[in-house]
């Protein structure tokens, strides 16, 4: 510990000018002090001053008041330092002197002599407020305060507690009288060395080395560090952990960056046609009645619904058709009747039923016929019932779909996925296709299902002419050429129009 | 105990770059109550301080080398690493890390044994 | 930049006290911390925070921090003591050490 008693005299009174021993001072008492503490006696005795002395130069003569002075010689309050923890408790004794000589350093002119002297026992705490005495005897009076005050740096009820206030990275500080830390703003923690982060940096992900910072950990992003960032290179896709690239639905590929939903992104099917995915950029487009052509965007003749009734002729006109009615049919379709039950209009078995008082009739047909007159046998497939291009076949009383590969069901409705069970190995990215899956390897890897590490990359030399797309992974360890409209050979270096004795197959 | 130890050449050309790695053993690196220095002493002489590093990878340089100084961590394999670039006759000292203790108000209580790194082609 | 400095040296007889100082610009107002080297050894902190010993240090090692001065007594001198002793100090973010003093036992 360290602190200092601090004792300020203010005024002595010696009117008759007189010593302790009953003699007068000639011309005048010329006062010096001495002042001893020490530790606690209940009986003060002589013996060292354990906690300090000191002396004073002659601050006057006989009755005098004594000014502050804060430095040099006289200086008031006087100051005694100690470098121990303070007990809280003191014995004081002060000495009014007279000397004949030197009035600076009184202490060691000879013949000095006691004018008179006081004596205090007492605790006192720690504190800035100054404690005021007065002390008479029959001569003399004192007036003085003391007090004791921590030294700089120091600290608590008894200055034994050391704290330096500090602003680096070992702490950012200020001390508390207790001597306890009071941090910065912006810092905490058991020394202020840890700052406090922008407010709702996150936890793991973000940290900072001053205060309303927040530096990003290495895959992470956004003023809070709270946003992952994806695979560098990530079209269409998000992360929830760093350099992931998680496709966005109709997607594909190790970047997402190949369109596996170009129905939807495109809609190339016109005239209400409905499109089927088939892996990357594929399509097929179902068409309506009526329509042709691969996007369905060619009109068929009119006359393609067979829209004329009783074995009517259709005949195609401008924007329109004209149905020609077989003898006893009128009517825009030939769908009125001149015939009666007596005609037997109704063929295979259909049974005829008079109406309109015998003017008409109605034909009900036995199972699998249909038509007006039951002449046509019933095709199930008319509805077109089969979904995703299946194929409708009649088979006698009822009919069956037949389903395009990756797809089952009644009706063909179902999907079944071939990457269900994720056949493409170091991380490739499986596409249903209708020949089975699709595997689009990462950088390295080559082969149907990914399964073949290539040293290097087979299409890096760029070995396939004339514009044509090169593809690894198709064969192991090798390339394929994808030769454009006009080329052939297995790098596409020879035009279409070679002798046919030439070797190349396209 | 923690113990301290440094590894790298002794021996680095003029203008190049000197390495140095200390490997903690004995405690976590990532303690949040140390910073961890490097200290030189060149030779017959008094010691110089470097820079340091935190855990987190907070870092604070000598201001007369800071433009030279490179102080990085590796917390999964507890420990720290100097480089300092443009090297001179004059960077030959021996160089030592030290931890340097929140608690003792930045005191360093432990040592590294130290390694002599002499610049000379 | 901020400087602390040393004597060069200082001599003492065995059960004597040897007393190095440090000085610097309102050193009074930093924590001083105090190492001893002896020759082809690391460097072995002996006092921190001015005052405080770290275990295992003998209680003959004490020290003390006020003004533009730091100072490290070491009570009872023993052959054993004789070693380089250097203080050092925090300016800001930078650590600072004092040029050395070598205490010789007689």
């Known amino acids: 510990g360290s602190g200092i008693f601090q004792l300020r005299l203010q005024e002595f009174v010696n009117q008759r000018g007189m010593l302790a021993n009953g003699q007068s001072c000639e011309p005048g008492c010329r006062t010096f002090f001495r002042i001893c503490l020490k530790h606690f006696q209940a009986t003060f005795s002589e013996g060292p001053c354990t906690f300090g002395n000191v002396s004073t130069p002659v601050l006057g003569t006989n009755s005098f008041v004594v000014r502050d002075k804060n430095s040099g010689s006289g200086r008031n309050p006087l100051q005694l330092p100690f470098n121990f923890t303070w007990p809280g408790t003191f014995s004081l004794n002060i000495q009014a002197w007279h000397t004949p000589g030197d009035d600076l350093r009184p202490e060691t002119s000879p013949g000095n002599s006691l004018i008179s002297q006081i004596i205090i026992q007492g605790s006192l705490a720690v504190g800035k407020i100054w404690r005021t005495d007065e002390q008479n005897d029959t001569l003399t009076r004192l007036s003085y305060s003391y007090r004791v005050i921590c030294s700089d740096n120091y600290y608590g009820e008894s200055c034994s507690r050391l704290c330096k206030k500090r602003d680096d990275h070992f702490g950012h500080y200020e001390c508390q009288p207790d001597g306890s830390l009071s941090c910065l703003p912006g810092w905490t923690g058991k020394y202020c060395d840890q700052p406090i982060c922008l407010s709702g940096c996150h936890e793991q992900n973000g940290y900072c080395s001053k205060p309303d910072e927040c530096i990003c950990r290495p895959g992470w992003q956004g003023r809070l560090c709270n946003e992952c960032i994806p695979h560098n290179g990530c079209r269409h896709g998000t992360c929830s952990i760093p350099w992931q690239c998680a496709c966005d639905e109709g997607w594909g590929g190790l970047f997402c960056d190949q369109d596996l939903n170009y129905c939807t992104h495109h809609s190339p099917c016109k005239n209400g046609s409905t499109c089927s995915n088939s892996g990357p950029k594929g399509y097929t487009c179902t068409c309506l009645p009526g329509y042709t052509g691969e996007h369905c965007e060619l009109g068929l003749s009119k006359c393609a619904s067979n829209p004329c009734r009783n074995g009517g002729s259709c005949k195609d006109q401008e924007n329109s058709y004209h149905c020609l009615c077989p003898p006893g049919y009128y009517g825009q379709h030939c769908e009125h009747s001149t015939l009666t039950c007596a005609d037997s209009p109704c063929f295979n078995g259909g049974s005829c039923r008079e109406r309109n008082q015998g003017s008409s009739y109605a034909c009900e047909c036995p199972p699998n016929f249909t038509g007006s007159n039951c002449e046509k046998k019933v095709d199930r497939c008319t509805s077109n019932p089969c979904a995703n291009g299946g194929q409708c076949q009649n088979r006698g009383p009822s009919r069956t779909c037949r389903c395009r590969p990756g797809f089952t069901g009644t009706h063909c409705e179902l999907h079944i996925s071939d990457c269900a069970r994720s056949p493409c190995a170091h991380g490739g990215t499986c596409h249903d296709l209708e020949n089975g899956p699709v595997c689009t390897c990462p950088a390295g890897f080559s082969g149907r299902r990914c399964e073949v590490r290539i040293t290097h990359d087979a299409c890096a030399s760029g070995p396939c002419f004339n514009g044509a797309t090169c593809y690894t992974g198709l064969s192991p360890n090798n390339f394929v050429c994808n030769c454009p409209y006009g080329f052939v050979g297995s790098r596409c270096e020879f035009p279409v129009g070679l002798p046919p004795s030439f070797p190349w197959v396209a | 105990e923690v113990q301290l130890q440094e590894s790298g050449p002794g021996l680095v050309k003029p203008s190049e770059t000197l390495s140095l790695t200390c490997t903690v053993s004995?405690?976590?690196?990532?303690?949040?109550?140390?910073?961890w220095g490097w200290i030189r002493q060149p030779p017959g002489k008094g010691l110089e301080w470097i820079g340091d590093?935190?855990?987190?990878?907070?870092?604070y340089y000598n201001p007369s080398l800071k433009s030279r100084v490179t102080i990085s961590v590796d917390t999964s394999k507890n420990q720290f690493s100097l480089k300092l670039s443009s090297v001179t006759a004059a960077d030959t000292a021996v160089y030592y890390c030290?931890?340097?203790?929140?608690?003792?108000?930045?005191?360093?209580?432990?040592w590294g044994q130290g390694t002599l790194v002499t610049v000379s082609s | 930049s901020y400087e602390l400095t040393q004597p060069p040296s200082v001599s003492v007889s065995p059960g004597q006290t040897a007393s190095i100082t440090c000085s610097g610009q309102?050193?009074?107002?930093?924590?001083a911390s105090w190492y001893q080297q002896k020759p082809g050894q690391s460097p072995v902190l002996v006092i921190y925070?001015?005052?405080k010993r770290p275990s295992g240090i003998p209680e003959r090692f004490s020290g003390s921090n006020s003004g533009d001065t730091a100072t490290l007594t070491i009570s009872g001198t023993q052959p054993m003591d004789e070693a380089d002793y250097y203080c050092?100090?925090?300016?800001?973010?930078?650590?600072?050490f004092g040029y050395g003093t070598k205490v010789t036992v007689l």
């Open positions: 030290a931890r340097q203790a929140l608690a003792m108000g930045g005191g360093s209580d432990k």
């Open positions: 004995g405690g976590s690196i990532s303690s949040s109550s140390y910073y």
């Open positions: 590093i935190y855990y987190t990878g907070s870092t």
């Open positions: 309102r050193l009074g107002d930093k924590y």
């Open positions: 925070e001015d005052s």
């Open positions: 050092q100090a925090w300016d800001r973010d930078t650590g600072v």
